[in-house]
């Protein structure tokens, strides 16, 4: 008689990343008997929820259930029915909801309550929805990329995961850019972390890590743009804002009420003699860069070194994975290649921003105008943030690797979050050998 294939002994987990601009659902899978091995968990599905981030549903919470339906139904299809009940579902909300909570805790709670009610209706093991801290967001992003890169494995490998890799055991730093916040997380070299709020201690797979992390609320790309507009409109002579961060010929009307809706613009708020103003693009990278730099005004630095806003930042150390919007924006601009120097990136940004809006629209006809119009700002912002904000140099730029996926799993905080909540990262080194790894994209 022929041997019958045994059913796969696998487990699944679902994490929803409720970001400021959108929600994504990730499905992870791993062999049940190898839970404690490093590198065995991988992503099998990403489902991007249609619509904005959950914080935008504050006045229409009754629509949240429908909003989540498609992706939750997709999860139902992907995961075998027999495993639905034992599959944990976690929802983590990030800076968009942190900002809403700052405005009104009650409204933030109401949104999360409805999210929880909706997710409880599915056959999975729903574990609740919560607003994760900026520190968690940074830490779990760091765990994710290092887990996927095999940095926690104590086994010596004959192959290299990445072409430029030197010391296999040196962890990567993590650079995460969202719509409302940005995180920087890395292991500093023999440097005491002068600010306790920025220090994390981990013991993972038998090794201790002293990690620096900080989340800059309001410095995600969307909130940074709102900040820049609020700052620049203060000195505008009328209701026309000539903006170097938008392409020549680009025009857009902005409501002052929308500009001042977010807590991120409070520091620039003033009474303006108009209810609306018009952005008129002039497409000048250098001027855009200068305007953005004003957002990084380093008031006083009570430490040996600061990033900006008086926040401690140790000297940068080692290689960094830059993901989420760092990757999406640079990928669109075709600037993710290892071979592109910082000087070349700057040159290309100058050319891109100077291109007329009509030309840009024709060249990228398939891209939504809302997103297309903001790539000049976003690209310039990424350069400004990395160079002036975090003090990368032309030389250390080569240590930044723009990463979308590693071994088919998205770089981001969600995998690290699930690994932690399912107790799949042991403090001590397990005895079994890890799986092999392939390269990242």
């Amino acid at each position: 008689t022929q041997n019958k294939a045994l059913p796969e002994n696998v487990k699944y987990g679902i994490v929803l990343d409720a970001g400021s601009s959108h929600t994504s659902l990730y499905i992870y899978k791993w062999p049940a008997e190898k839970e404690n091995d490093t590198g065995v968990v991988h992503q099998v599905e990403e489902c991007r929820v249609k619509g904005p981030g959950i914080s935008k549903f504050v006045q229409k919470v009754n629509e949240i259930g429908i909003y989540l339906t498609d992706c939750m139904e997709r999860a139902r299809e992907v995961i075998p029915r027999s495993q639905h009940q034992e599959t944990p579902v976690y929802l983590g909300a990030t800076a968009g909801m942190r900002l809403l909570r700052m405005e009104s805790e009650e409204l933030a709670d109401r949104v999360l309550d409805v999210v929880e009610r909706s997710l409880s209706n599915y056959p999975f093991d729903f574990q609740g929805a919560r607003i994760i801290t900026g520190q968690e967001e940074g830490a779990y992003g760091w765990i994710t990329i290092n887990y996927l890169l095999g940095k926690f494995s104590q086994k010596t490998r004959w192959f290299s995961i990445v072409p430029y890799e030197t010391n296999n055991q040196e962890t990567f730093g993590a650079l995460d850019l969202g719509g409302a916040s940005t995180q920087v997380t890395f292991v500093p070299q023999n440097q005491t972390i002068e600010s306790p709020d920025n220090a994390l201690q981990f013991r993972l797979y038998g090794k201790d890590y002293n990690v620096y992390t900080h989340s800059f609320l309001c410095y995600g790309k969307d909130q940074a743009l709102w900040q820049k507009l609020a700052k620049d409109i203060q000195v505008a002579s009328n209701e026309i804002l000539r903006d170097p961060c938008f392409h020549p010929g680009y025009k857009k009307v902005v409501n002052v009420s929308d500009l001042y809706k977010t807590p991120c613009t409070k520091r620039f708020e003033m009474t303006l003699p108009f209810q609306q103003f018009e952005i008129q693009g002039i497409g000048n990278y250098q001027q855009c860069h200068q305007s953005i730099l004003e957002l990084f005004a380093t008031a006083g630095c009570p430490y040996s070194q600061c990033a900006f806003a008086g926040i401690f930042l140790p000297p940068l150390q080692g290689d960094f994975g830059a993901f989420s919007a760092f990757y999406f924006v640079m990928k669109f601009l075709n600037l993710t290649s290892e071979k592109v120097s910082q000087e070349k990136v700057t040159e290309m940004m100058k050319k891109f921003c100077a291109q007329p809006w009509e030309e840009i629209k024709t060249s990228y006809a398939g891209v939504k105008e809302k997103y297309l119009s903001e790539y000049c700002f976003s690209g310039t912002y990424i350069l400004s943030l990395l160079l002036q904000g975090y003090h990368f140099t032309a030389d250390s730029w080569e240590h930044i690797h723009f990463i979308g996926k590693i071994q088919g799993s998205d770089a981001g905080w969600t995998l690290g979050y699930m690994l932690n909540l399912t107790n799949m990262i042991p403090a001590e080194q397990p005895l079994s050998t890890p799986l092999s790894h392939s390269t990242y994209v």
Epitope: E105, D109, E116, A129, R130, I131
Partner: antibody
Amino acid sequence: QVQLVQSGAEVKKPGASVKVSCKASGYTFKSYEMHWVRQAPGQGLEWMGRINPSVGSTWYAQKFQGRVTMTRDTSTSTVYMELSSLRSEDTAVYYCARGKREGGTEYLRKWGQGTLVTVSS
Amino acid sequence: EIVLTQSPGTLSLSPGERATLSCRASQSVASSYLAWYQQKPGQAPRLLIYGASNRHTGIPDRFSGSGSGTDFTLTISRLEPEDFAVYYCQQYHNAITFGGGTKVEIK
């Protein structure tokens, strides 16, 4: 809608213990802390402590430490408050009250109907 | 622990009048950590104001909160018959404490 339903009135002798329950419904039980507050007849409100139903961690007011125990049963969405070594001055109405989500601020949004505990020999 | 002192102990007013209730802390309290509750006889307390000045869902706009540091105020702009009750302030700083209460009674 959110409801907190408490167990019925109790009469206890001095030195005994009392266990009051509070059953929550209408929301995700694990997501909000639960507090206990008491009110002696004709007196003001006195905070006793809180429990995080997600992990079971507790924080008790100094005055009640060693005498109060707060627990939860996630399968029934119920929290319990047990007070031991009862004395006459523990005669009061005991309220459970839903507190904050993690990262929120400590105010008590929703209260149970109260449970009268009378301590008398 | 932070002690909250409410004054006056009793406030005798007529419907339609303005009520001003005071809550003083023994040390500075972050505004986000101060709340006000209303309690009627035989009922559980009800949250009115949180974060010193934010009205809880469903609370009429005649109720307003203000203050910072050690001095906080609850104002009822025009007393309605249903507003006659006891009012408590509450703070959070490691532990929760309540003020002794102010009784608003009909004159």
